[in-house]
């Protein structure tokens, strides 16, 4: 099979994942301890290999008794990291991942950082701030995103195969122009990534180039390929 023209284009439609912190300037805002603060859960997609900072509810330090981070990762015992203000003491239970740490000393900053984010960091992270007025929670459902590797090739006469390899979550594949496509295949890997494969055929001889467009939460990519001539075809007028 000769390798005919294959071009890559990375679209400009990428989602903004560079700023992997949801910590606003809210700590500088004096908050009334309203019931709204009592329980907040955030679903947060974060790209693998980036750094992430997770923050606690905006409670003034003087009102604090204990800060606890509870980390529940798939297939592992719950890890807790706590800090007691009165004794200036930190404690960890079942925490073995050295990439998950306090941003600085907890008396300075209660935020948690993941440096860098790995696929195993999918899970639930919760900050519990104990105060004389009660406990205030902020939870994160962290979804680690993995950019798929995109490939496109012509397998046989006017049939092209587009693969989005090892993405998380699964990518979506579309074609320009639409072809006669087999059902999309998905292959699930043990680490939670998915390979998606789309195979399409174009009967019309006026189709010169086909474009495979891969949509993913980490950004969109397109590849295009000029189809080879049908064997035996010599000359045609369009």
């Amino acid at each position: 099979q000769s390798n005919n023209s294959l071009m890559l284009q990375t679209s400009k439609e990428n989602h903004t994942l560079a700023s992997n912190s949801l910590c606003m300037d809210e700590k500088q805002i004096t908050q009334n301890h309203s019931k709204v603060l009592a329980e907040v859960n955030i679903s947060w997609p974060v790209q693998m290999a980036r750094n992430a900072v997770l923050c606690c509810p905006p409670i003034e330090f003087r009102n604090l008794i204990v800060i606890t981070w509870e980390i529940i990762l798939r297939g592992q015992p719950s890890c807790t990291k706590s800090y007691r203000k009165e004794t200036n003491e930190t404690k960890e239970t079942n925490c073995t991942d050295e990439r998950i740490t306090w941003v600085s000393t907890p008396d300075q900053n209660s935020d948690l950082q993941i440096h860098p984010v790995a696929i195993t960091h999918d899970g639930y992270y919760r900050c519990i701030m104990a105060t004389p007025d009660g406990n205030f929670h902020r939870g994160y459902h962290l979804q680690v995103l993995v950019t798929p590797e995109v490939t496109l090739f012509e397998s046989r006469n006017r049939t092209a195969v587009c693969k989005a390899v090892a993405g998380k979550p699964a990518a979506q594949i579309s074609w320009i122009p639409a072809g006669d496509c087999a059902p999309t295949e998905q292959e699930y890997w043990g680490n939670g990534t998915v390979t998606v494969k789309s195979t399409c055929h174009w009967e019309g001889h006026n189709v010169s180039t086909v474009t495979c467009h891969v949509s993913h939460l980490t950004g969109n990519k397109s590849l295009y390929i000029e189809l080879l001539p049908v064997p035996g075809a010599k000359k045609s007028a369009k």
């Epitope: 390798n3 023209s5 679209s11 189709v207 397109s222 390929i225």
Partner: antibody, heavy 114, light 107 residues
Framework: QVQLQQPGSELVRPGASVKLSCKAS????????MHWVKQRPGQGLEWIGN????????NYDEKFKSKAKLTVDTSSRTAYMQLSSLTSEDSAVYYC???????WGQGTLVTVSA | DVQMIQSPSSLSASLGDIVTMTCQAS??????LHWFQQKPGKAPKLLIS???NLEDGVPSRFSGSRYGTAFTLTISSLEDEDMATYFC?????????FGGGTKLEIK
Amino acid sequence: QVQLQQPGSELVRPGASVKLSCKASGHTFTSYWMHWVKQRPGQGLEWIGNIYPGSGSINYDEKFKSKAKLTVDTSSRTAYMQLSSLTSEDSAVYYCLTMTGTSWGQGTLVTVSA
Amino acid sequence: DVQMIQSPSSLSASLGDIVTMTCQASQGTPINLHWFQQKPGKAPKLLISGASNLEDGVPSRFSGSRYGTAFTLTISSLEDEDMATYFCLQFTYIPWTFGGGTKLEIK
């Protein structure tokens, strides 16, 4: 780095023929379609046709099928376009292009004049 | 054949302006395209391949985007050297077809 070399200009008589060349380097010549495009002075661009050097397969735009003839010589990595029965309407710059239209030659100016 | 409708055919803008031009395939046919810049007496220069991919060496003020079946070339801050004619090329269907061009002049 793909390069397509074309002669700068050709002066031909009305009714005559001319064979334009396009010598390729920097890529697998037989694996990429070669296209030809026409641009008349101060006007838009028109696609003439394409040829696949690996098999000799050719497509022509209907408008150019009796005007242009595309050929290749794989040993010299050169594509050719012969234009016949030339008139003043054929005076134009002719470009060859490959790699799905991302690599262009500098163009050959064909002037048809008595 | 797929006709490429390009607009405007000409435009005049000041240095520093944001400039946009559009190409759309007839009947809203889904296609892919390239954007080129051409200066008098020169061969077309590829700016954007495959609708949105900025070519090496092309200033970052140029960008391409797709909105459904419409394609836009944007110059974020116009410079003197951008005075040229711009055109699109659809390469999905044979025959390949070009937009009519947008002649950009500096005010």
